[in-house]
């Protein structure tokens, strides 16, 4: 890749670690990183926020949108359809409250996160709130006998997976409640297991169970998931985060349930166990994107290997040009504290440096005391990390890995990104109907934000999944003359970019357009000075 001219223009982008960006080697690039070099205004990484009691009011949602939330995640492990319908309504009300100013309006996507095929324990002594203490070294019998479904205690524990005795062996580990409690199987019966408590603790009702290494044969899509997915179609959600995906056929089953009416919903597969990691390539091929769900993954595979899985999955998604989300415990301490730990700050930054398209908040925004601060913190860290990416090497590798193609859109995308580096462009403006042109540009990871202009609201919302895309929704009526309509949308993008501080008069931007109306015709790249 050609290096940018150091004297090129006066674009804001020059303060974005430009000295480091021009280094000849990765080590030299690291040596040149400068804590006093401010990042540009735009943040390229998407921020996904889980909505819960701490954040579901319209007022809080408005503030979260202002703070940088791009996607609202609804966790269907909890809550009724009525509860989630209300949340969706609130997200849309908050989003549309900014609609009066098309230049500052931000489309916010809605994501439905499925419960998935979970294994859960029964009720402790008939109560949803009761707890018992499991002592290290104690014997605990696991039973499938429904008589104990609501009568679990420190001696006997019922769980809802009927085949557990077939899939675990003597010596197998069983983890309960996010791995806080660990049991080792000592004896197997037809419908019971005798285990020893290896790691004790307080056990509550209906806790999740993990069976690392076991070939768990639960259906990919439970009856509850089916109803939830259909509810999602009815509610017009933009994406599904499909839990515990283990193989490609699981993804196809989700796609089948979404049906014809849900054809446009993106399926993001959550990789949460060893089988999912092992069969990653087939899952990636079947999915629209991937979520590195580090919570369950860290129980199902050794904790010290989670970072390897993260890097591998992000790398393969980047290579394939599919979006990847990094999730779980990113700013966990901010549930209770207004500032993250230094380790959490580094974790967010390193996810961005690894190449994640989006970063996610869970309890931080759903139930935490500082939801807005958590969003703002992710925004600030992501911006700094993006400035520190060694684009010289990254673009070179992405370009080399891309197959030779005669697809005009693909070729134009590569050229646009290269040109944007060469002339330090303030942005790349893309006119897109389906979003494909913008996705292809994003695949090559430009430093400049990609302002994707579309008239399709869902295209705009779904574009947040891709690193670098800043979607803007054009609501102006279509002009009769195609060239005039192109100019209208490009000018709209120019106004948005200037209002947002992405560039100013005299900077240059790259503009990508088609040669005729419709999808699939993007083939024209122009370098345009900002008027």
């Amino acid at each position: 890749m050609s290096k940018p001219h150091s004297e090129a223009g006066t674009a804001f982008i020059q303060t974005q670690q430009l000295h480091a960006a021009m280094a000849d080697t990765f080590l030299e690039h690291m040596c040149r990183l400068d804590i006093d070099s401010p990042p540009i205004t735009a943040r390229n990484t998407g921020i996904i926020c889980t909505i819960g009691p701490a954040s579901r009011s319209v007022e809080t949602l408005k503030e979260m949108i202002k703070s940088g939330m791009n996607v609202a995640r609804l966790n269907f492990s909890h809550g009724t359809h009525e509860y989630h319908a209300e949340t969706i309504k609130n997200v849309r009300t908050a989003t549309e409250s900014f609609a009066s100013d098309p230049i500052l309006y931000r489309p916010v996507a809605v994501a439905l996160d499925t419960k998935g095929p979970e294994i859960r324990t029964g009720l402790i002594k008939g109560s949803g709130t009761a707890e018992v203490e499991l002592k290290k070294g104690a014997t605990l019998k696991i039973t499938l006998d429904n008589a104990y479904m609501e009568k679990c205690d420190e001696n006997i524990l019922w769980l809802d997976y009927k085949n557990i005795c077939k899939v675990v062996e003597v010596g197998s580990k069983i983890y309960v409640d996010d791995g806080l409690i660990s049991l080792q199987v000592k004896q197997k019966g037809a419908d019971f297991l005798v285990t020893e408590v290896e790691n004790g603790g307080s056990l509550g009702s209906k806790k999740g169970v993990n069976l690392p290494g076991a070939a768990v044969d639960l259906p990919a899509v439970s009856e509850k998931d089916i109803q939830d997915l259909k509810f999602g179609v009815e509610q017009d959600v933009d994406m599904v985060f499909a839990s515990f995906i283990r193989k490609a056929s699981d993804v196809h089953e989700v796609r089948k349930v979404l049906g014809e009416k849900g054809k446009n919903i993106k399926i993001i597969s959550k990789i949460e166990n060893h089988e999912g990691v092992r069969r990653f390539d087939e899952i990636l091929e079947a999915s629209d994107g991937i979520m590195v769900a580090r919570g369950d993954l860290g129980i199902e595979i050794p904790a010290e290997k989670v970072f390897l899985a993260q890097k591998m999955m992000i790398g393969r998604c980047n290579r394939a040009g599919k979006p990847v989300i990094c999730a779980t415990q990113m700013l966990e301490s901010m549930i209770k504290k207004p500032r993250p730990t230094r380790a959490e700050g580094s974790d967010v930054a390193n996810a961005v440096l690894d190449g994640a398209d989006c970063i996610m908040l869970s309890g931080e925004t759903a139930k935490g005391d500082y939801p807005l601060e958590a969003v703002r913190m992710q925004h600030l860290i992501a911006r700094e990390a993006e400035a520190a990416i060694y684009h010289l090497q990254l673009f070179e590798e992405l370009r080399r890995l891309a197959p030779i193609t005669s697809d005009p859109t693909e070729a134009t995308a590569v050229g646009a990104v290269e040109a944007s580096f060469k002339c330090c462009s303030g942005a790349i403006i893309v006119l897109t109907k389906s979003g494909r042109s913008a996705h292809q540009v994003a695949r090559y990871r430009p430093r400049a934000p990609i302002i994707a202009v579309t008239r399709n609201p869902q295209t705009a919302r779904q574009a947040h999944l891709y690193r670098g895309i800043f979607p803007v929704l054009c609501k102006d009526p279509v002009q009769e003359a195609w060239a005039e309509d192109v100019d209208l949308r490009v000018n709209f993008a120019m106004n948005v970019g200037k209002a947002r501080g992405f560039f100013k008069k005299g900077d240059v931007v790259i503009v990508l357009t088609g040669w005729r109306p419709g999808s699939g015709f993007t083939n024209t790249m122009r370098v345009v000075p900002v008027p």
Epitope: Q227, K230, F231, G232, H252, G259, E260, K261, K263, I267
Partner: antibody, heavy 116, light 111 residues
Framework: EVQLQQSGPELVKPGASVKLSCTAS????????MNWVKQRPEKSLEWIGR????????LYDQKFQGKATITADKSSTTAYLQLSSLTSEDSAVYYC????????WGQGTTLVTVSA | DVVLTQTPLSLPVSLGQPASISCKSS???????????LNWLQQRPGQSPKLLVY???NLESGVPDRFSGSRSGTDYTLKISRVESEDLGVYYC????????FGSGTKLEIK
């Protein structure tokens, strides 16, 4: 388990109208499209049209425009097919189906038009 | 509208032998998400149709693995590796890419 229960057989006079029903149980129909399909004896399946029960939008094969009207009632999770100006050509089995993973089918309703 | 052309209209086959049904589409059924919106249905005599294969090549749960679906461009094929008596009936290709979905059907009968 999702099931589609269709109304019983109909014996009707030529020129009359008829309204067939299809009720989904264990399922909220607004998350899918409901299709109606015609099958004459020993013949292939013919698509009549479909409805989006969430908003009432319907779509018909040109051949059935003016002949068929598809409606839905969200609250009772029921879809309806009304056929007007019946002739012997309309005698067939009518199926409701939704794309619940590429179609869940009702058991079919037999319609026979008979002269007085 | 998409036109699905199914061949043959009738397929006499001996039990235990393989069978192959073809369906040609007048246009691509690959949607923008990269998936192929073509399914195969089976209709046994006197029964409602039932889903066999979805998204061109995925077997519906409970369907025997002697059935398989494949795609080559706009040509789709349903194969039965060894025909059994319960397989007799009419097979339809059906697309959910756009409306007017059905092929003309192929009747599988015993030779």
């Amino acid at each position: 388990e999702v099931q589609l229960q269709q109304s019983g057989p109909e014996l009707v006079k030529p020129g009359a109208s008829v309204k067939l029903s299809c009720t989904a149980s264990g399922y909220n129909i607004t998350g899918t499209y409901m299709n109606w399909v015609k099958q004459r004896p020993e013949k292939s399946l013919e698509w009549i049209g479909r409805i989006d029960p969430a908003n009432g939008d319907s779509l018909y094969d040109q051949k059935f425009q003016g002949k068929a009207t598809i409606t839905a009632d969200k609250s009772s999770t029921t879809a309806y097919l009304q056929l007007s100006s019946l002739t012997s050509e309309d005698s067939a089995v009518y199926y409701c189906a939704f794309d619940y993973g590429g179609h869940n089918w009702g058991q079919g309703t037999t319609l026979v038009t008979v002269s007085a | 509208d998409v036109v699905l052309t199914q061949t043959p209209l009738s397929l006499p086959v001996s039990l235990g032998q393989p069978a192959s049904i073809s369906c040609k589409s007048s246009q691509s059924l690959v949607y923008s998400n990269g998936k192929t919106y073509l399914n195969w249905l089976q209709q046994r005599p006197g029964q409602s149709p039932k889903l066999l294969v979805y998204l061109a090549s995925n077997l519906e749960s409970g369907v025997p693995d002697r059935f398989s679906g494949s795609r080559s461009g706009t040509d789709y094929t349903l194969k039965i590796s060894r025909v059994e008596s319960e397989d007799l009936g009419v097979y339809y290709c059906v697309q959910s890419y756009t409306h007017v979905p059905f092929g003309s059907g192929t009747k599988l009968e015993i030779k």
